[in-house]
């Protein structure tokens, strides 16, 4: 049996229904069997877990997703073995295997793989700060969302009106969410907002930076 699945990965928003398309061509016999299974990201195919079987004219959903899985066509004997997964969770992200068996059609292995990503908006990020906050010093502002798929990009902005910082004194990394401020001055003080964004939405946090005069060293 030759199984056909989309070549491009599938993305479905959190809470929506994912349709994992799987089709095939074979003269369906009484021994026809379909199995859908799931592998977590980064795990080998050998560690797949069954989530649905169809055999002897009957459908058997199984495992932790059993209440949420069904077939677009039941019975799946018309060439369409497409799986529907409702109310998708972040833990549904991974690889799905569609395997069709129909002895004596052994021309190919009857296996198709579909990668599913559940799209999750960024959670409210956590803003933190470390380093020297005295004039002339350097500090790092960090921003990180614990949730979000695809991984959010981070953008720092300073709120309010202020003099333009000198070039190179404010460098941010959109991937790590880090903003490095160098050569701090009193005018560097203020509120900084980090916005975490992906295709599902955005979330933000704010942090107030207070730059102080360096403490005067005394000679005894």
């Amino acid at each position: 049996v030759e199984v056909k699945v989309p070549t491009e990965p599938l993305s479905t928003p959190l809470g929506k229904t994912a349709e994992l398309t799987c089709t095939y061509s074979t003269s369906v016999g009484d021994s026809f069997a379909l199995e859908w299974s799931f592998v977590q990201p980064g795990k080998p195919i050998s560690e797949s877990h069954p989530i649905l079987y169809f055999t002897n004219g009957h459908l058997y959903p199984t495992g932790s997703k059993s209440k949420r899985v069904s077939l677009l066509q039941n019975p799946p004997t018309v060439g369409v073995a497409t799986l529907k997964l409702t109310d998708v969770h972040p833990s549904d992200t991974g690889t799905y295997l569609c395997q069709v068996n129909n002895p004596p059609d052994f021309y190919t292995n009857g296996l198709g793989l579909i990668n599913l990503t559940v799209l999750v908006p960024p959670s409210n990020p956590l803003c933190s700060q470390s380093g020297q906050t005295s004039v002339g010093g350097s500090t790092a502002l960090r921003c990180s969302s614990s949730e979000g798929a695809p991984k959010p990009v981070y953008n720092w902005v300073r709120l309010g009106t202020f003099p333009t910082p000198s070039p190179g004194s404010m460098v941010q990394d959109e991937v790590s969410g880090q903003l490095i401020l160098t050569n701090l001055s009193l005018t560097s003080s203020g509120t900084y907002r980090c916005v975490a964004t992906n295709q599902m939405g955005s979330a933000s946090c704010e942090l107030t930076l207070s730059v102080t005069e360096p403490s005067q060293g005394r000679v005894a």
């Epitope: 030759e2 056909k4 089709t23 061509s25 074979t26 003269s27 369906v28 016999g29 009484d30 021994s31 026809f32 002897n56 004219g57 019975p75 004997t77 018309v78 060439g79 369409v80 004596p104 059609d105 021309y107």
Partner: antibody
């Protein structure tokens, strides 16, 4: 040599019923998916029903669904098509055909003519 | 349902001619296409399946090509026995449908 021989065609009034038969020989009937394909006079081919090797799965196009029933008796190497609520547009030569491992039709019978007319 | 469209509907040719018939599917059917030959008053005969595979006994002057939505049946050198009507059929998802046919007649 593979042989498929249809019988049971004839003249029937609209709304009437007819049962077609197909006697198979020359191959292992119980291992083969089978279909009925029809051809209206002067027209093209239309698949009308299929059945799996042991009879567990049957399929029909919308044009005949609910009116036609395909069945088989593997002990007798026979295929059947029960046709109810017949319409004028069901007038055609009905062929019995064996399916390959993929659903193309590798052997055909000579056909039997069904005429639906008042 | 997948629609199959053949062209031309009729083709006039002479013995020895190279003849090409086209079949288009309304959606991707990969290589799941069969071709049949039918002579008047006779049952169709399988010529090609999986777009390009010839069953045993089919003369090598017949060949098939294509994948996706566009397919061709070619007769490299038309013989007297080849004047007939030719049909394509997809063997992908149910319902399996046929093209309307191409009649190859003597010029």
């Amino acid at each position: 040599e593979v042989q498929l021989v249809e019988s049971g065609g004839g003249l029937v009034k609209p709304g009437g019923s007819l049962r077609l038969s197909c006697a198979a020989s020359g191959f292992t009937f119980s291992n083969s998916g089978m279909s009925w394909v029809r051809q209206a006079p002067g027209k093209g081919l239309e698949w009308v029903a299929s059945i799996s090797d042991g009879g567990l799965y049957t399929h029909y196009p919308d044009s005949v669904k609910g009116r036609f029933t395909i069945s088989r008796d593997n002990a007798k190497s026979s295929l059947y098509l029960q046709m109810n609520s017949l319409r004028a547009e069901d007038t055609a030569v009905y062929y019995c055909a064996r399916q390959g491992v993929r659903p193309f039709f590798d052997y055909w019978g000579q056909g039997t003519l069904v005429t639906v007319s008042s | 349902d997948i629609q199959m469209t053949q062209s031309p509907s009729t083709l006039s040719a002479s013995v020895g001619d190279r003849v090409t018939i086209t079949c288009r599917a309304s959606e991707n059917i990969y290589s799941y296409l069969a071709w049949y030959q039918q002579k008047p008053g006779k049952a169709p005969k399988l010529l090609i399946y999986n777009a390009e595979t010839l069953p045993e006994g089919v003369p090598s002057r017949f060949s098939g090509s294509g994948s996706g939505t566009e397919f061709t049946l070619t007769i490299s050198s038309l013989q007297p026995d080849d004047f007939a009507t030719y049909y394509c059929q997809h063997h992908y998802v149910i319902p399996w449908t046929f093209g309307q046919g191409t009649k190859v007649e003597i010029k």
